[in-house]
Interface confidence: medium
């Protein structure tokens, strides 16, 4: 239904606290360099304005769209051009082009320092002094670094952050309580960020139809007892919600997400037997719980999929008369039977089925032609199963850090032109798949591995798109979203690459490495490893092991030395010489 004042409508639906959080996220995602204080001032102005519209929907400007109101606020910021350069050109445009322009200027890799968590005591002090401001800073810092973070989910993580601090700041050993809990929240949030970026990429590059297909497969896996009509309704709603969030319509997105949660809880009987526990929770937790819900039990009496989609003589008629509906039904039926497959794999199978019907329904004897289609799925299913098996075996043998290094070598060989920081970030994330997925039961491994890898590779594609340097990466990133992971897996050593010159300074280290936290130390070593591979793309595993082992010993030795600086200065050049020799 239409409302006189969109902003008043959203304020009333969402409540002041969530409204303010979402406006802060929106501004932080659009203008990623602005300090918190500047954004919070704008948030307060927008909130005050929304309140005047709640009091009187006919008040001046209350009938303007939210994009217009937000855009006008952003464009009124002094020195916008000084800080944001050509983004300021957006302000010359009218809506909806102005918002489109803002979206195009979102930076997936903003030049911001890594978010440093303050020391426990300091954190607790500032949290207890002003919890609202503390959590506001959290929203701002995460949103500006992740301009596509799913806004209502970010509010949920802020709530989690709040819970952890409330609990731990009363403990005697605050750090012991905070560190593991905040690490867990951070890990989940980072995964959520790459997953949502993938959804927005899907929406931006391939449109709503592609996203809806993804949603149909996912919902069918989770709710195998729901009928196709119900799954279609849920998928349509989820598509709309994600489109809104990816498009910067965060208030509408959060409001619609809450509505969907309400609908699901009111219709549990036709959706899933697993929803009740989620439905007793408050709104943010309820939506999050529903998004993470375990799969319902598969109905016991499902007939063979072949009956409807291979053996039936009307297959070509069904397909010709309503292609999307028929393919949607196929995707639904296949997905509800296979919670053990990744969504990417299910979409590849649906694509294969579609291609088979396109070919066969034009031939003289269609049933004979499409009769073997299910057997032809086998290699498509085996490929990711083998990927999971070999990678999980490697992870179990090497552990997370060793596995990350193996992945780093592999990807540096595939795309040595890509910048080292990007390769290290991608390999570290790809390497985490082991810890995340390989410990799961067999039936959950494939969906976990492949859908996680797809999201990480999407991040690599997004960063590469900004400064394209590798033809191979461009090729894999340009194709269909569901073919990306197999495309990257199939890449081999780039034979066209001219090895990088050996630069001693790249492998020169100083005593500051000794005081770095473990994670930063690992990154330094992995940076050196990537540079080694760029220098010698065809180095053997043994050669790399020798050099990296030598490097680790060197760092260990010098960090234990009485005169660390002197040790690094004298031993460093020896290490470089030995490394050159080992790789000759």
């Amino acid at each position: 239904e239409a409302h006189k004042s969109e902003i008043a409508h959203r304020f009333k639906d969402l409540g002041e606290q969530h409204f303010k959080g979402l406006v802060l996220i929106a501004f932080s995602q659009y203008l990623q360099k602005c300090p918190y204080e500047e954004h919070i001032k704008l948030v307060q102005e927008v909130t005050d304005f929304a309140k005047t519209c709640v009091a009187d929907e006919n008040a001046e400007n209350c009938d303007k769209s939210i994009h217009t109101l937000f855009g006008d606020k952003l464009c009124a910021i002094p020195k916008l051009r000084d800080n944001y350069g050509e983004l300021a050109d957006c302000c010359a445009k009218q809506e909806p082009e102005r918002n489109e322009c803002f979206l195009q200027h979102k930076d997936d890799n903003p030049n911001l320092p890594p978010f440093q968590r303050p020391e426990a005591e300091a954190m607790c002090t500032s949290f207890q002094e002003n919890p609202t401001s503390f959590l506001g800073h959290y929203l701002h810092e995460v949103a500006r670094r992740h301009p596509y973070f799913y806004a209502p989910e970010l509010l949920y993580y802020a709530e989690k952050y709040n819970e952890v601090l409330t609990q731990c700041c009363t403990e005697s050993d605050k750090a012991a309580c905070l560190t593991p809990k905040l690490d867990a929240v951070k890990e989940k949030a980072l995964v959520a960020a790459v997953r949502q970026r993938m959804k927005c990429s899907s929406m931006q590059r391939f449109g709503e139809r592609a996203f809806k297909a993804w949603a149909v497969a996912r919902m069918s896996q989770r709710f195998p007892n729901a009928e196709f009509a119900e799954i279609t309704k849920l998928a349509t709603d989820v598509t709309k919600i994600n489109k809104e969030c990816c498009h910067g319509d965060l208030l509408e997105c959060a409001d619609d997400r809450a509505e969907l949660a309400k609908y699901m809880c009111e219709n549990q009987a036709t959706i899933s037997s697993k929803l009740q526990a989620c439905c007793d929770k408050p709104v943010l937790q309820k939506s999050q719980c529903l998004a993470e819900i375990e799969h319902d039990n598969i109905p016991a009496d499902l007939p063979s999929i072949a009956a409807d989609f291979v053996e039936d003589k009307e297959v070509c008629k069904n397909y010709a008369e309503a292609k999307d509906v028929f393919l949607g039904t196929f995707l639904y039926e296949y997905s509800r039977r296979h919670p053990d497959y990744s969504v990417s794999l299910l979409l590849r199978l649906a694509k294969k089925y579609e291609a088979t019907l396109e070919k066969c329904c034009a031939e003289g004897d269609p049933p004979a032609c499409y009769g073997t289609v299910l057997a032809e799925f086998q290699p498509l299913v085996e490929e990711p199963k083998n990927l999971v098996k070999t990678n999980c075996e490697l992870y179990e043998k090497l552990g997370e850090y060793g596995f990350q290094n193996a992945v780093l070598v592999r990807y540096t060989q595939k795309a040595p032109q890509v910048s080292t920081p990007t390769l290290v970030e991608a390999a570290r994330n790809l390497g985490r798949v082991g810890t995340k997925c390989c410990t799961l039961p067999e039936a959950q491994r494939l969906p976990c591995v492949e859908d996680y890898l797809s999201a990480i590779l999407n991040r690599l594609c997004v960063l590469h798109e900004k400064t394209p340097v590798s033809e191979k990466v461009t090729k894999c990133c340009s194709g269909s979203l569901v073919e990306r992971r197999p495309c990257f897996s199939a890449l081999t050593v780039d034979e066209t690459y001219v090895p990088k010159e050996f630069k001693a300074e790249t492998f020169t280290f100083h005593s500051d490495i000794c005081t770095l936290p473990d994670k930063e130390k690992q990154i330094k070593k992995q940076t050196a490893l990537a540079e080694l591979v760029k220098h010698k793309p065809k180095a053997t595993e043994d050669q790399l092991k020798t050099v990296m082992g030598d490097f680790a010993q060197f760092v260990d030795k010098c960090c234990k030395a009485a005169d660390k600086d002197n040790c690094f200065a004298t031993e460093g050049p020896n290490l470089v010489a030995r490394s050159k020799e080992a790789l000759a």
Epitope: A226, E227, F228, A229, E230, P303, A307, D308, F309, E311, D312, K313, E314, V315, K317, N318, E321, A322, V325, F326, G328, T329
Partner: nanobody, 126 residues
Framework: EVQLLESGGGLVQPGGSLRLSCAAS????????VAWFRQAPGKGREFVAG????????YYADSVKGRFTISRDNSKNTLYLQMNSLRPEDTAVYYC???????????????????WGQGTLVTVSS
């Protein structure tokens, strides 16, 4: 759950017409793939005609094409089978069957339809 109740059967002469009705309750008929099957004495159930749920795509057995027409009235939640030019070999018990959640029939196999009416007898004889 879907309940189906057929009516409209009876005795008719060859060349005559009949209109069968199937009233559905428990679910909207336009969301459901529905079909008519028939069973002649001593034979198995045979697909006659079907219509998709949500999309009005119709399906007919070769033996009835051009003579029978399947339709539905969503406001009355009722399925119909208009039978013209009836022949003695059309004599059978006619059943209405439903596959909820199916946008298309996607099958003429009786076993794949979970919901059935009790049937109405059609006799074509002079």
């Amino acid at each position: 759950e879907v309940q189906l109740l057929e009516s409209g059967g009876g005795l008719v002469q060859p060349g005559g017409s009949l209109r069968l009705s199937c009233a559905a309750s428990g679910r909207y008929i336009d969301e459901t793939a529905v079909a008519w099957f028939r069973q002649a004495p001593g034979k198995g159930r045979e697909f006659v005609a079907g219509i998709g749920g949500g999309v009005d795509i119709t399906y007919y057995a070769d033996s009835v094409k051009g003579r029978f027409t399947i339709s539905r009235d969503n406001s009355k939640n009722t399925l119909y089978l208009q039978m013209n030019s009836l022949r003695p070999e059309d004599t059978a018990v006619y059943y209405c069957a439903a596959r909820p959640g199916r946008p298309l029939i996607t099958s003429k196999v009786a076993d794949l339809y979970p919901y059935w009416g009790q049937g109405t007898l059609v006799t074509v004889s002079s």
